[in-house]
Amino acid sequence: LPAQVAFTPYAPEPGSTCRLREYYDQTAQMCCSKCSPGQHAKVFCTKTSDTVCDSCEDSTYTQLWNWVPECLSCGSRCSSDQVETQACTREQNRICTCRPGWYCALSKQEGCRLCAPLRKCRPGFGVARPGTETSDVVCKPCAPGTFSNTTSSTDICRPHQICNVVAIPGNASMDAVCTSTSPTRSMAPGAVHLPQPVSTRSQHTQPTPEPSTAPSTSFLLPMGPSPPAEGSTGD
């Protein structure tokens, strides 16, 4: 004989568990329906009536199948140094991330506690390591034969153009200037950019200790304070 399909609420067989999207109600001692995401339990089940679900009110949500008496409150509005990357709906909480050009300097539990602007490397310095969601840009001096003439959190040092005849030699912050005859090889116009970090939520991971050339921070200096650092600037 085919097994009968039990409709909630029903008493489970001894030693068995309730089915998917059902829960065992201790008071009624029955398997009862859970409420779907976006809803909550308005009335709990009894031996004769199933769970009564109701939609979450504005600014509240449930993300999972549940039997909670009240929906969870969405988080506060995003701080002014953050942007809302996921709105508060009946089925999901609001998510705030650091605004473009910023990174999360301090993560706590679900989100970012403190956003900070990405360091900008000043002329003569280029990006050695791009910023990520949780780490700042690292600047480095442009090596001989390369330059950066911008104040930027994305531009790297790029090679000087090679001239048939040099009018003004290049330095760390300026490209070479050729005489009116065209250069043998010229770099493409415009600065070379590193991609900005994609703004999605991520776990706070500890970056590999690497000395920074920035004036605002460096990390793990067992011999004491660093010599004066250069190469970056504020906004």
Epitope: S76, S79, D81, L106, Q109, T217
Partner: antibody
Framework: QVQLVQSGAEVKKPGASVTVSCKAS????????IIWVRQAPGQGLEWMGW????????NSAQKLQDRVTMTTDTSTSTAYMELRSLRSDDTAVYYC?????????WGQGTLVTVSS | DIVMTQTPLSSPVTLGQPASISCRSS???????????LSWLQQRPGQPPRLLIY???SRFSGVPDRFSGSGAGTDFTLKISRVEAEDVGVYYC?????????FGRGTKLEIK
């Protein structure tokens, strides 16, 4: 008990650099940030910057950004603040304090005098 | 930057009487995590600052219960129910909701 002990007073000439140290004890150094605050004679408190002792992430006041370097040495539970190109208006008592959500323990302060 | 405006800048009070200091921020101090990172510091003459109140109304350990903090959003108050001689000094409100952290200009509490 939690303590932050700072280095001693300094007298510097304009254009020089100064490094103030802040040795922490009584807690796990890497689980808190350190802020640096200064107070010019007879003036209020001025926030200079914050550094994470966990990963070195930091942020400093925009007006000081080109002149200040904050570092941490987790092996000795010490934070450092270096201020370069000193000017007479940098004369102040410099404080370190623990925290980011709130600043619960403070160093005793380090007087830096900039005078020619 | 968030500007913290304290009033009054000076407050002469009688011993045993209450005192109240107001602090207003130029924008809401409510963080997206739901917390409001507003603290009150006391600085006695010749001493470093000392934490009194954090997250608007939580009293730090060892702080007498005559100190209380209240407020929300952009308006905050520090109250001393009965001023004692040892309360003389400058009181600062400070926000650490976002960078740059900022302080009020301070309120000098003195005895009449």
């Amino acid at each position: 008990q939690v303590q932050l002990v700072q280095s001693g007073a300094e007298v510097k000439k304009p254009g020089a650099s100064v490094t103030v140290s802040c040795k922490a004890s009584g807690y796990t150094f890497s689980t808190y940030g350190i802020i640096w605050v200064r107070q010019a004679p007879g003036q209020g408190l001025e926030w200079m910057g914050w550094i994470s002792a966990f990963n070195g992430n930091a942020n400093s006041a925009q007006k000081l950004q080109d002149r200040v370097t904050m570092t941490t040495d987790t092996s000795t539970s010490t934070a450092y603040m270096e201020l370069r190109s000193l000017r007479s208006d940098d004369t102040a008592v410099y404080y370190c304090a623990r925290g980011e959500d709130f600043f619960d323990y403070w160093g005793q302060g380090t007087l830096v005098t900039v005078s020619s | 930057d968030i500007v913290m405006t304290q009033t009054p800048l000076s407050s002469p009070v009688t011993l045993g009487q209450p005192a109240s200091i107001s602090c207003r921020s130029s924008q809401s101090l409510v963080h997206s995590d739901g917390n409001t990172y507003l603290s009150w510091l006391q600085q006695r003459p010749g001493q470093p600052p000392r934490l009194l109140i954090y997250k608007v109304s939580s009293r730090f350990s060892g702080v007498p219960d005559r100190f209380s903090g209240s407020g929300a959003g952009t308006d905050f108050t520090l109250k001393i129910s009965r001023v004692e001689a040892e309360d003389v000094g400058v009181y600062y409100c400070t926000q650490s909701t976002q960078f740059p952290f900022t302080f009020g200009r301070g309120t000098k509490l003195e005895i009449k």
